[in-house]
């Protein structure tokens, strides 16, 4: 068996207590990517494939991602968010299909992740895409984060 | 550490319907697919069909399509197994299991013995 | 359904022996395969996922390899407690999906 990530809540316990309730279910949109994922190709499949993922820094302990998709093809997507060098520690979170971005918090601070996510259609998986990237290294990134924020909400540009 | 607590054994009647309960206590309960397989005396495993309880939607075998019903309830836990029009054939140990990403399932219950006879 | 057909049915080794388990799908599942391990009156217990991923804490005799229709599962040098049977089960179906009819591991 697989065991949780050793934190105190686990990113899925404390994402579901977060989001799971309201209707606006994680759906910023990122900017500044840290890790780009490439199509993890199994074989033919005669179902649609998500298309580019992108992760990003949120705080010091969350990641964002976004992904996309074709519109309305999808019933869930499926992610799973573990820490690169513990493969048993993986967390798997189950979304609507309409999403094609979300947070995920609760992660450890200055720790390198790897992301996975499929689609589901028809009852059917679709390939998996998976990206690296780390969580920010502590209060510094969060300042220059927060800076960024402001810098780009008076001159409303965004940078993608 | 998840753990997956079933039901105790059943005896019911050829045409009932029998419904077997699956608490689970670990991890994320709603986030994860639980599924039900049965395993018939001296016979293989056959998958019955599943559920995310987050979204509360089910997937069944074609085999098995329309005569169960998988449901679950988040605020408890547990997950349910309803098989209805039972025949002798249904006479199996029923196990709920935990998917992983991939779907392999990594955490199973006990298993709960349905015995249908006249 | 997709149907998936394991091959032989039973094998007879001993100790020591190199063991390979044949599974077929009926359609291309990619590598959507998983392997399990039975013994008499417990549940399964999962072996393989993704077709030749290891499940924490099996024993690195086992592997997996295979993508598609054709898949297989070795045991490099077969233990006591490797006499059992083993399915294979596809995982394209959401969430989880059919089995393959087994194959017992029996000492010759």
């Known amino acids: 068996g697989s065991t949780a990530i050793g934190m105190k809540e686990t990113a899925a316990a404390k994402f579901e207590r977060q989001h799971m309730d309201s209707p606006d279910l994680g759906t910023g949109g990122g900017s500044g990517i840290e890790g780009r994922g490439s199509m993890g190709y199994r074989g033919s499949e005669d179902l649609p494939q998500l298309g580019d993922l992108a992760v990003s820094e949120v705080g010091w302990d969350g990641l964002r991602l976004n992904w996309t998709a074709a519109d309305n093809a999808y019933e869930h997507f499926v992610i799973q968010v573990q820490e690169v060098n513990k493969v048993e520690a993986a967390q798997n979170l189950t979304l609507p299909g309409s999403l094609r971005a979300v947070d995920i918090p609760g992660l450890e601070a200055a720790t390198p992740y790897r992301v996975s996510i499929y689609g589901v259609i028809r009852g059917y998986r679709t390939p998996v895409l998976s990206a690296e990237a780390s969580t920010a290294s502590g209060l510094n990134d969060i300042f220059e984060a927060q800076k960024i924020e402001w810098h780009e909400g008076t001159h409303h540009h965004h940078h993608h | 550490q998840v753990q997956l607590v079933q039901s105790g054994a059943e005896v019911k009647k050829p045409g009932s319907s029998v419904k077997v309960s699956c608490k689970a206590s670990?991890?994320?309960?709603?986030?994860?697919?639980i599924s039900w397989v049965r395993q018939a005396p001296g016979q293989g495993l056959e998958w019955m069909g599943g559920?995310?309880?987050?979204?509360?939607?089910?997937n069944y075998a074609q085999k098995f399509q329309g005569r169960v019903t998988i449901t679950a309830d988040k605020s408890t836990s547990t997950a349910y197994m309803e098989l209805s029009s039972l025949r002798s054939e249904d006479t199996a140990v029923y196990y709920c299991?935990?998917?992983?990403?991939?779907?392999?399932?990594?955490?199973w219950g006990q298993g709960t013995t349905v015995t249908v006879s006249s | 359904d997709i149907q998936m057909t394991q091959s032989p049915s039973t094998l007879s080794a001993s100790v020591g022996d190199r063991v390979t388990i044949t599974c077929r799908a009926s359609q291309s599942i990619s590598s959507w395969l998983a392997w399990y391990q039975q013994k008499p009156g417990k549940a399964p217990k999962l072996l393989i996922y993704?077709?030749?991923s290891l499940e924490s804490g099996v024993p690195s005799r086992f592997s997996g390899s295979g993508s598609g229709t054709e898949f297989t599962l070795t045991i490099s040098s077969l233990q006591p407690d490797d006499f059992a049977t083993y399915y294979c089960?596809?995982?394209?179906?959401?969430?989880?999906?059919?089995f393959g009819q087994g194959t017992k591991v029996e000492i010759k």
């Open positions: 670990g991890g994320t309960f709603s986030s994860y697919a």
């Open positions: 089960q596809q995982n394209k179906k959401f969430p989880s999906g059919t």
């Open positions: 559920i995310i309880p987050i979204f509360g939607t089910a």
């Open positions: 299991a935990k998917g992983n990403f991939y779907g392999g399932l990594d955490y």
């Open positions: 993704d077709a030749s």
